[in-house]
């Protein structure tokens, strides 16, 4: 993936389609790589990432990774191709429009990851699957 400040626009000459034949265009994702976070013991959190990037490739989706160890909590936001593993895990939920966190086994830390395929969907990370209603006040974001 190209750096977040390099905005990639859709490539009209190399059309990528999904299983239904719909054109897949590069999506907008939060892209701050790894940042310290205060998100803990909450049903959902905002990324607090101010960088909205256009993903390099049409097939890429938004990803968020939440990690907690004895020292700190971090949140990673990126674009990534779901055909490729990320942190050694397959992105099972890449077609989801929302970023629903799922716990993964990692020694020495608590590790949650989610992926999703709607614009800027990794800005709101959801830890509780019952938490499915959009709260506009919570989800308002500023573009850059």
């Amino acid at each position: 993936t190209i750096p977040p400040h390099v905005q990639k626009s859709v490539n009209n000459d190399m059309i990528v389609t999904d299983n239904n034949g719909a054109v897949k265009f590069p999506q907008l994702c939060k892209f701050c790589d790894v940042r310290f976070s205060t998100c803990d013991n909450q049903k959902s959190c905002m990324s607090n990432c101010s960088i909205t990037s256009i993903c390099e490739k049409p097939q890429e989706v938004c990803v968020a990774v939440w990690r907690k160890n004895d020292e700190n909590i971090t949140l990673e936001t990126v674009c990534h191709d779901p055909k490729l593993p990320y942190h050694d895990f397959i992105l099972e939920d890449a077609a989801s429009p929302k970023c629903i966190m799922k716990e993964k086994k990692k020694p020495g830390e608590t590790f949650f990851m989610c992926s999703c395929s709607s614009d800027e969907c990794n800005d709101n990370i959801i830890f509780s699957e019952e938490y499915n209603t959009s709260n506009p006040d919570l989800l308002l974001v500023i573009f850059q």
Epitope: V10, V23, P136, Q144
Partner: antibody, heavy 116, light 107 residues
Framework: QVQLVESGGGLVEPGGSLRLSCAAS????????MSWVRQAPGKGLEWVGR??????????DFAAPVKGRFTISRDDSKNTLYLQMNSLKTEDTAVYYC???????WGQGTLVTVSS | DIQMTQSPSSLSASVGDRVTITCRAS??????LNWYQQKPGKAPKLLIY???SLQSGVPSRFSGSGSGTDFTLTISSLQPEDFATYYC?????????FGQGTKVEIK
């Protein structure tokens, strides 16, 4: 193939209202931020506003000249974007384009003429 | 809002000429600068994104440069199909504002 087709343009008197529609096809509309951009006759391009996805609350942003008068909405079940224009002024006369926000897909445009 | 100022507003050139259009932002926009080409009666077409990256399918005679507040679009050898109006646009902040345009006409 991505298609964005605007409709609803026409002649309206100052102070009147008009609703533009943009029918989208060929892509996952519900996943995308969408924008409206306008161009007055013989003038440059002017961004009007955007709507984010319903999944992120459907938040909208507007350019200063239309804030409080224009609203943007979307119907993901119909793959359609709307621009509701109220309290229209003569300076709102323009071709209005529907666009996939920050990406290079545009409709053909629809002309709105505000005149008495 | 960030103001985008293009110069010149119009220019006359001949086929084969090297043409340069500049765009200045009222504050730093990093590399969040796009260049569009528009022909009469048509929707704009993206030429350059992120200040210097060529959009797929756009001829290599088009190039962009700059960062911060000053940006340039260069057409190395003007072709008949390049006579059009060119716009810069910043996508650094909302609203994503356009320059006023530069019309490239046949001399």
């Amino acid at each position: 193939q991505v298609q964005l087709v605007e409709s609803g343009g026409g002649l309206v008197e100052p102070g009147g209202s008009l609703r533009l529609s943009c029918a989208a096809s060929g892509f996952q509309f519900s996943n995308a931020w969408m924008s409206w951009v306008r161009q007055a006759p013989g003038k440059g391009l002017e961004w009007v506003g955007r709507i984010k996805t319903t999944y992120s609350g459907g938040a909208t942003d507007f350019a200063a000249p239309v804030k409080g008068r224009f609203t943007i909405s979307r119907d993901d079940s119909k793959n359609t974007l709307y621009l509701q224009m109220n309290s229209l002024k003569t300076e709102d006369t323009a071709v209005y384009y529907c666009t996939l926000d920050l990406r290079d897909y545009w409709g053909q445009g629809t002309l709105v003429t505000v005149s008495s | 809002d960030i103001q985008m100022t293009q110069s010149p507003s119009s220019l006359s050139a001949s086929v084969g000429d090297r043409v340069t259009i500049t765009c200045r932002a009222s504050q730093s926009i990093s590399s969040y600068l796009n260049w569009y080409q528009q022909k009469p009666g048509k929707a704009p077409k993206l030429l350059i994104y992120a200040a210097s990256s060529l959009q797929s399918g756009v001829p290599s005679r088009f190039s962009g440069s700059g960062s911060g507040t000053d940006f340039t679009l260069t057409i190395s050898s003007l072709q008949p199909e390049d006579f059009a109006t060119y716009y810069c646009q910043q996508s650094y902040s909302t609203p994503p504002t356009f320059g006023q345009g530069t019309k490239v006409e046949i001399k």
